[in-house]
Interface confidence: medium
């Protein structure tokens, strides 16, 4: 039997279903507009309402801002007409889409206002070190609610070459397992890229001064990161897990990863940054246990034990 489309359209009812919504965390910067997204399907046509911090929120009734609300949609954009406006709209938002058959609810959308990132003003003293010694050049980017990417460059905007000896850690610091006279430069610059504000900021240049020596003394490995012998961390099921070990010493130590509590899940493990970083994709219950990094050179070794507890996300 063929049922005409128009017949079906009039008689088949559908409860509301949220089809599109903003991410759970939304960071708004001072020069941005605020856009909150909520789309839903349903028959008869759904009606939308919003709450902020549990209280009914009507974007169109907000004073001193321009609001664009899409027709047949719960999505809206608030145009910022002053540098303080994002502050006013911080909070936890929720969208409700209703028709005769019921109500669908979006997840909680946490809207955070953040200042455009700036590095604290500081005077950077030259870093003096003897050839063969280790050194850490700090980056310390400003705190940010959004993820940021760190790069080390020189004043000619050329990336600092990284290898087994020279490594940038997850924290943004630049680690030298041992320095060579060729590392002697006055313009090590840490750049922080904040995708949310389309902003790149740079730290004051660091002047690394390497004093030449006639004989470089061999040193057994020592961990620069982490500095303690063991650490405990919680990994969430289904999320990635990143473990890191950075060592100093001369000759340059190599890093190995072991799993005393069982086999390494080879299909889900990748090693990056010249083996200094172990990344486990999509953590599962079976990944619970100890992961050990071993830094070795001809004079000896240093180790760190990560004790990982897997919890439900």
């Amino acid at each position: 039997i063929q049922i005409p489309e128009e017949y079906e359209g009039h008689h088949v009812m559908e409860p509301p279903v949220i089809t599109e919504q903003s991410p759970r965390r939304l960071v708004v910067f001072p020069t941005d507009d605020i856009s909150l997204k909520c789309e839903a399907s349903g028959k008869p046509e759904v009606q939308f309402r919003w709450t902020r911090d549990g209280v009914h929120f009507k974007p169109k009734e907000e004073l001193g801002v321009t609001v664009y609300q899409s027709p047949h949609s719960g999505s809206f954009t608030i145009t910022g007409n002053n540098s303080n406006f994002a502050q006013r709209f911080q909070g936890i938002y929720r969208c409700f889409a209703s028709n005769k058959l019921g109500t669908a609810m979006s997840h909680e959308i946490r809207l955070m206002a953040e200042g455009a990132p700036k590095w604290p003003k500081e005077t950077v003293k030259p870093v003096e070190v003897e050839e063969g010694e280790s050194v850490v050049l700090p980056c310390n980017p400003p705190p940010s609610a959004e993820p940021l990417r760190i790069y080390w460059m020189n004043s000619k905007i050329l990336h600092i070459k990284q290898d087994e000896r020279v490594t940038m850690g997850q924290n943004g610091n630049l680690y030298f397992a041992n320095v060579l006279t060729s590392d002697n430069h006055s313009d090590y610059i840490c750049h922080a890229h904040f995708p949310g504000t389309r902003t790149i900021i740079q730290k004051e240049p660091i002047d690394l001064r390497v004093k030449a020596t006639n004989s470089m003394i061999d040193r057994k490995p020592r961990l620069l990161f982490p500095t303690n012998s063991s650490s405990h961390l919680v990994a969430l099921q289904g999320q990635p897990l990143v473990l890191e070990c950075i060592a100093e010493g001369f000759p340059t130590p190599t890093i190995k990863w072991l799993r005393p509590s069982g086999p390494m899940p080879a299909d889900r493990v990748t090693y990056q940054n010249h083996n200094k970083t172990l990344q486990l994709l999509k953590v599962g219950e079976e990944d619970d246990g100890e992961y050990r990094c071993l830094a070795e050179n001809s004079l000896g070794s240093a180790r760190h034990a990560y004790y990982v507890t897997v919890e439900a996300a």
């Epitope: 020069t31 540098s83 303080n84 406006f85 455009a116 700036k118 389309r198 902003t199």
Partner: antibody, heavy 118, light 113 residues
């Protein structure tokens, strides 16, 4: 590092207009609202208004609405303030300053001294 | 508009002395959603631009000596210099950035005896 460069002095005749500039460097120009502040000799500070360099949106102190016009040139990372129908009351130092919607005005230009005299 | 009142208008102290200056606003500067007071203190030395000392009423700007302390909440605020140095000779302004138009106090002039 962040710098806001303003020319030192402007001498203008009563009734004329003047366009003050503020050249920004060392940060992403479109990420901060630019503020303008007036200081008459021996007097306090008065907020004139602000402009969002990313979209040119402005917000003025009512007192200066008919006096000042704020604009930006994104290509040169420069903010401008045009002052019209100048009188002796407009003789002052005018500062541009950065405010990022969060931490107050933490970077200031050196100021342009405007003297209105025939 | 929010009116900012500063007192005293001037004061003269000896090096090493403790100084407090007051700033009162005609409306509360406490922003409920993040519990921060939108008040800043600036220092302006003769012939120079203002320099930010304190924001959010009590947070010291990086690079500002720890002898400068901001305190208060709502409508009453204080800037304290624990042990005045000769280089602290300046005008000190408070400013609210809670509501438009932003407004400044008339300033406190600090002189050294």
């Amino acid at each position: 590092q962040v710098q806001l460069q303003q020319p030192g002095d402007e001498l203008v005749k009563p009734g004329a207009s003047v366009k003050l500039s503020c050249k920004a460097s060392g940060y992403t120009f479109t990420s901060y609202w630019m503020q303008w502040v007036k200081q008459r000799p021996g007097q306090g500070l008065e907020w004139i208004g602000e402009i969002n360099p990313s979209n040119g949106r402005t917000n003025y102190n009512e007192m200066f609405k008919s006096k000042a016009t704020l604009t930006v040139d994104k290509s040169s990372s420069t903010a401008y303030m045009q002052l019209s129908s100048l009188t002796s009351e407009d003789s002052a130092v005018y500062y541009c300053a950065l405010y990022d919607g969060y931490y107050a005005m933490d970077y200031w230009g050196q100021g342009t001294s405007v003297t209105v005299s025939s | 508009d929010i009116v900012m009142s500063q007192s005293p208008s001037s004061l003269a102290v000896s090096v090493g002395e403790k100084v407090t200056m007051s700033c009162k606003s005609s409306q509360s500067l406490l922003y409920s959603s993040n519990q921060k007071n939108y008040l800043a203190w600036y220092q302006q030395k003769p012939g120079q631009s203002p320099k930010l000392l304190i924001y959010w009423a009590s947070t010291r700007e990086s690079g500002v000596p720890d002898r400068f302390t901001g305190s208060g909440s709502g409508t009453d605020f204080t800037l304290t210099i624990s042990s005045v140095k000769a280089e602290d000779l300046a005008l000190y302004y408070c400013q609210q950035y809670h509501s438009y138009p932003f407004t400044f106090g008339s300033g406190t002039k600090l002189e050294i005896k």
